[in-house]
């Protein structure tokens, strides 16, 4: 018996078509993805083959301006229409809280929404009861699947899910949601979540009775063959691990923003078992024609987006100084802004001996594109703040060690005064610098904001300490030349879109005044 | 649990028609084929015949004009049917799942006048 | 038709030997073999599928190994209940099996 199962992950609001680096369409010619193209996709595999599912492993939530005006009611909708089989949570899916859960998505998706390792406790309990589950049995054809949901137990910091929610270890939790669809007598189970692809790969090894894993969060493209694009495959699609009680388990994710559509087929036999497993991403570049009816309703939703752009997020009393011949060459008030707004969208107090769990942001000189005038009316709109930050990145979470931030910042002046992007903006740091001597030995002092306190304070950085630090996915990624972030950090989870978690601020303050205080000298 | 069994004549006299049945439980027929085999005592085991999820079937070339095997979905049943029965195929019966993760008990067959 | 050559048709071991059973096809067989247990009186029991997939409740000194058309049968360290007919059996195209290993006490 033969499976076919689709798959998404990390889809972060790009429901309309996208460039080929997931940035806003330019030429449409050549841009790829978004629903109204995976919708022509999705139909095409469902009317030529028998037993279809279409599953997405979170992260629906976050990345664009849709979700900024929607609020996740775009994702119930969109996917309501591409009749979504099932869906795993994701960390971002608690972005606005729970609130900002249930009422858009919980209660208003037609599809089974899946963890099996989040714990409801306390009043919310009984409120969000039914709204998610840990497991669902689809019936595909003459067979049923069951599919098992999970999501990343780092989701408290990386997210706003609140106090009633109890993230658990994922293998804990999952084990014995199979062993009760066995009970059931349901033999093919399919693990659906949102842990990263070296959870998905324990998944894989350690619970018993699961066939299939299709995950998320790493943003992780693997890929059979040559690769269709620019993405690198990190293994081959499907990735095989042979679990502990020696099975070939096939565990896949289809990279992120929706530029890809896993397609996995897998063979069954009598008992459940997998037989056989193969396929690969489908690129949904041009050549997929976009659906009529699903962009003509794109076209519909889009308005009220572009009335958006122009409104007013709140007022600026300075003059906001995002301009390359300061951003590039010593501390500008606008990257404080951005770094500020930056470390205040990752406020999580989940743990009394800290005041919260990061209190560093580093953000590239270069990736700040424009200033922002106070003399008209001190009006900020998200139309300006596109203009600051044109990229469509996001601000993420990683781990670096104390020797890594000591590299990153020689990097950050190592060819100082050409003007060049890497000229680093901080916040929670302070760096001082001494310009007379040779490149890799400028940094002479490096002080960094404790987390374990509870009155904050700058201490020297430790080379061998872990440090959070909030930055660019850019720097991550290791652009810039920033080659040590990507090659050392200990973790790295994506973050929410760098417009948004300044529009966020900003919206919060109501007024601004940051100033050039001393950060970097 | 997935389970199969053989139903059949335990004795069949030279040149009749041997009819046997395979029940199954814990899975569809609409889903997954079964295969016939058998093994002559003290010999190997030889394939005989398959009916796929489709209704459709194949045959070993050595019997072809001799078997036929159906199904009735509704009652999760196989027949096959071997004519001109002859001493040389007594042997045990089995059917087992499309992909021989699951295997009857077997029911012996004697062909003897 | 694929031909299925099984090597050993028998042998002589005793407890806590490594035993190895090789099969060849004819043709390329893409992984799809599986591995049979008989036993006097007892059903067909399916040890191995796909070549290395372990049947569940399968001790784990049970391993298959191989591709294309050379495949193999490791009891890593022989227990009583062990001692069987082994078959190898491929599922590419009509079933055919191997000619079976006879696994006796020494």
């Known amino acids: 018996w033969e499976l076919t199962i689709l798959h998404t992950n990390d889809v972060h609001s790009r429901l309309e078509q996208t460039s080929e680096d997931s940035s806003k369409c330019v030429n449409a010619s050549r841009c790829m993805g978004g629903v109204a193209r995976l919708f022509t996709k999705v139909q095409q595999i469902r009317r030529a083959e028998p037993n279809v599912l279409l599953l997405d492993a979170g992260d629906q939530y976050q990345g664009t301006i849709w979700f900024t005006v929607y609020k996740g009611a775009e994702v119930a909708h969109f996917m309501n229409a591409l009749r979504y089989d099932a869906m795993a949570l994701g960390n971002h899916e608690f972005d606005n809280g729970v609130e900002g859960l249930i009422e858009p998505l919980l209660k208003e998706a037609k599809f089974p929404i899946l963890s099996a390792n989040i714990k409801a406790k306390g009043p919310l309990a009984s409120q969000i009861s039914g709204l998610y589950l840990p497991y669902k049995v689809l019936p595909v054809g003459d067979e049923v699947v069951g599919i098992v949901g999970y999501t990343s137990k780092e989701t408290p910091f990386l997210s706003n899910p609140g106090t009633n929610l109890v993230f658990e270890d994922e293998i804990t939790a999952l084990q014995p949601e199979v062993d009760k669809l066995k009970t059931l007598n349901v033999n093919k189970i399919i693990a659906l979540g949102h842990s990263g692809f070296e959870m998905d790969k324990l998944i894989a090894q350690k619970v018993r009775g699961v066939d299939v894993v299709v995950g998320g969060h790493s943003n992780t493209f693997l890929y059979t063959g040559n690769p269709p694009s620019k993405e690198v495959p990190a293994g081959k699609y499907p990735f095989i691990v042979t679990s502990d009680d020696g099975r070939k388990v096939p565990v896949v994710q289809a990279y992120a923003f929706g530029k890809y559509l896993g397609y996995l087929k897998i063979e069954f036999d009598e008992r459940g078992n997998v037989i056989s497993s193969h396929g690969n991403p489908i690129l949904l570049n041009s050549s997929i024609p976009e659906d009529p009816s699903i962009k003509a309703d794109i076209n519909k939703w889009r308005i009220k987006l572009d009335n958006y752009s122009t409104q007013e997020l709140g007022k600026t009393i300075v003059y906001l100084d995002g301009s390359s011949q300061s951003c590039r060459f010593r501390e500008c008030n606008m990257g404080n802004l951005i770094c500020d707004a930056m470390i205040n969208n990752n406020l999580r107090h989940t743990d009394e001996m800290f005041w919260n769990h990061v209190s560093m942001c580093i953000l590239n000189g270069g990736g700040i594109r424009s200033p922002i005038d106070e003399r008209n009316n001190g009006t900020i709109t998200w139309e300006n703040l596109a203009a600051v930050l044109p990229f469509g990145g996001t601000f993420d979470l990683v781990q670096l060690k104390g020797s890594t931030l000591k590299k990153a910042f020689e990097h950050s002046v190592h060819r100082y005064g050409q003007s060049t992007g890497e000229f680093l903006q901080v916040g929670g740091i302070h760096v001082v610098y001494d310009l007379s001597r040779k490149p890799g030995d400028r940094v002479v002092k490096l002080d960094v904001l404790c987390t374990k306190c509870r009155v904050p304070s700058y201490d020297p950085l430790k080379m061998d300490e872990v440090y959070k630090v909030i930055l660019p996915n850019f720097l991550a990624n290791g652009g810039d030349g920033f080659q040590m972030i990507k090659d050392e950090l200990l973790r790295h989870d994506s973050g929410d879109q760098d417009i948004n978690v300044v529009s966020t601020y900003i919206s919060k303050m109501k007024v601004i005044y940051p100033a050039v205080e001393g950060r970097i000298k | 649990e997935v389970t199969l069994k053989e139903s059949g004549p335990v004795l069949v006299k030279p040149t009749e028609t041997l009819t046997l049945t395979c029940t199954v439980s814990?899975?569809?027929?609409?889903?997954?084929?079964i295969q016939w085999i058998r093994q002559p005592p003290g010999k190997l085991l030889e394939w005989l015949a398959v009916?796929?999820?489709?209704?459709?079937?194949d045959y070993n070339a050595a019997f072809i004009s001799r078997l036929t095997i159906s199904k009735d979905t509704s009652k999760s049943q196989v027949v096959l049917t071997m004519t001109n029965m002859d001493p040389v195929d007594t042997a045990t019966y089995y059917c087992a799942g499309q992909y021989g993760s699951v295997w009857g008990q077997g029911t012996l067959v004697t062909v003897s006048s | 038709d694929i031909q299925m050559t099984q090597s050993p048709s028998s042998l002589s071991a005793s407890v806590g030997d490594r035993v190895t059973i090789t099969c060849r096809a004819s043709?390329?067989?893409?992984?799809?073999l599986n591995w049979l247990q008989q036993k006097p009186g007892k059903a067909i029991k399916r040890l191995i599928y796909?070549?290395?997939s372990l049947d569940s409740g399968v001790p784990k000194r049970f391993s298959g190994s191989g591709s294309g058309t050379e495949y193999t049968l490791t009891i890593s360290s022989l227990q009583p209940e062990d001692f069987a007919t082994y078959y190898c059996l491929q599922y590419a195209g009509s079933w055919t099996f191997g000619g079976g290993t006879k696994v006796e006490i020494k």
């Open positions: 814990g899975f569809s027929l609409s889903s997954y084929g």
């Open positions: 009916i796929w999820s489709g209704g459709s079937a």
């Open positions: 796909a070549t290395s």
């Open positions: 043709q390329d067989i893409g992984d799809r």
